[in-house]
Interface confidence: low
């Protein structure tokens, strides 16, 4: 399977709510031994690797904000440590593995990593990740709402979470 | 802060069983593989198992098993190890040990260690 | 099992040296998936171990960049460029390539 970026960059308002997505494509197994572990971190741009580093969204790490299930089923974070700091990871049917931050500062800017590890039977791994810029702004030149910018070099889109 | 805090040490009599527990704050408890270590004279060291606290699920060194059992209790962020039928043999310190990359094997928090001493 | 073999079993070292330290195992621990899983821990006096060096060369957050570990396959290598007091305990190398997870025997680095 494979990891695809819907947006490589994302410039909100502060005081924005915002979703950043990643999507799960390609052949998923659904063995009864295999499951799924998602989750996002901040990061940098590498000189070897992007994503490389992992460092904590609003003080929660990786493994706070993690997502376990089998195949392509539902889930989210419904922990209120999450909730508390104004974050939600979910995982639908379709592939698409999404956090959604709210009520977005200038602190909130940098590079923003989705991980997604298959693992069979505890151990093998195959991970990949998706890696995504978030601009938040404030005064003037700020938008009114939330743009995303597609990864490849399509029109922008006017997004804000719900 | 992330912590991992064991149960006090046990004195046990050969034959007899112990459960000893490790409570796990300041991270959420299910997004690591939590692992089972034994230190034997303050030196050599030996992995007993993980248990995948989320699903329950459990690896174990083959040496290990039949004597020890590892469970979790998702409601109190607490894993356990349960060692049955105790010689000599069994007496060390024992560790619990959070999976940094939730299942990789290596391990970046470790409990303070739980001292087994099995004597008549 | 996969076995794991330190040497030196002890370092003696003056503060400021350099330290070396090697760990063989007696398979590859190049998993299926091209990754290597070789760990190395630093236990101090009364303590439990902690974390210094991940899949080979990849120093854990807050490690000291004296610390560094190389090698491939089947020989491995942890150098301490210029040795500090706090160094000083047992050095435990890890493999988790291959279940059950295996241990060096310790190389304890102490003040000559």
């Known amino acids: 399977f494979k990891v695809a970026t819907l947006y490589s960059l994302y410039v909100c308002p502060e005081g924005q709510n915002v979703t950043l997505t990643c999507r799960v494509f390609g052949p998923v197994d659904k063995g009864h031994d295999v499951t799924f572990y998602k989750t996002w971190y901040r990061s940098s741009r590498g000189e070897v690797q992007t994503c490389s580093e992992r460092r904590p969204i609003r003080n929660l790490t990786f493994q706070d904000l993690h997502l376990h299930h089998g195949g392509h089923q539902a889930a989210n974070t419904s922990h209120d440590l999450a909730q508390r700091h104004g974050l939600e990871s979910a995982s639908d049917h379709h592939g698409n593995f999404s956090i959604t931050m709210r009520n977005l500062t200038l602190l909130d800017s940098g590079l923003y990593c989705c991980l997604v590890v298959e693992i069979r039977h505890h151990h093998s791994e195959h991970r990949v990740h998706g890696a995504m810029e978030l601009q938040v702004q404030t005064g003037k030149d700020a938008p009114s709402s939330c743009v995303a910018y597609p990864s490849s070099s399509q029109e922008s889109e006017n997004i804000t979470a719900a | 802060e992330v912590q991992l805090q064991q149960s006090g040490p046990e004195l046990e009599k050969p034959g007899a069983s112990v459960k000893i527990s490790c409570k796990a704050s300041g991270y959420s408890f299910t997004g690591s593989n939590m692992n089972w270590v034994k230190q034997n004279n303050g030196k050599s060291l030996e992995w007993i198992g993980n248990i995948d606290p989320y699903y329950g699920y459990t690896t174990y060194n083959q040496k290990f098993k039949g004597k020890a059992t590892l469970t979790v209790d998702k409601s109190s962020s607490t894993a356990y190890m349960q060692l049955k039928s105790l010689t000599s043999e069994d007496s060390a310190v024992y560790y619990c040990?959070?999976?940094?990359?939730?299942?990789?094997?290596?391990?970046?928090?470790w409990g303070a260690g739980t001292t087994v001493t099995v004597s008549s | 099992d996969v076995v794991m073999t330190q040497t030196p079993l002890s370092l003696p070292v003056s503060l400021g040296d350099q330290a070396s330290i090697s760990c063989r195992s007696s398979?590859?621990?190049?998993?299926?998936?091209?990754?290597?899983?070789l760990h190395w821990y630093l236990q101090k006096p009364g303590q439990s171990p902690k974390l210094l060096i991940y899949?080979?060369?990849n120093r854990f957050s807050g490690v000291p960049d004296r610390f560094s570990g190389s090698g491939s396959g089947t020989d491995f290598t942890l150098k301490i460029s210029r040795v500090e007091a706090e160094d000083l305990g047992v050095y435990f190398c890890?493999?988790?390539?291959?279940?059950?997870?295996?241990f060096g025997g310790g190389t304890k680095l102490e003040i000559k």
């Open positions: 890890s493999q988790s390539t291959h279940v059950p997870y295996t």
């Open positions: 040990a959070r999976d940094y990359d939730y299942a990789l094997g290596y391990f970046d928090v």
């Open positions: 899949k080979v060369s």
């Open positions: 398979q590859s621990l190049v998993h299926s998936n091209g990754n290597t899983y």
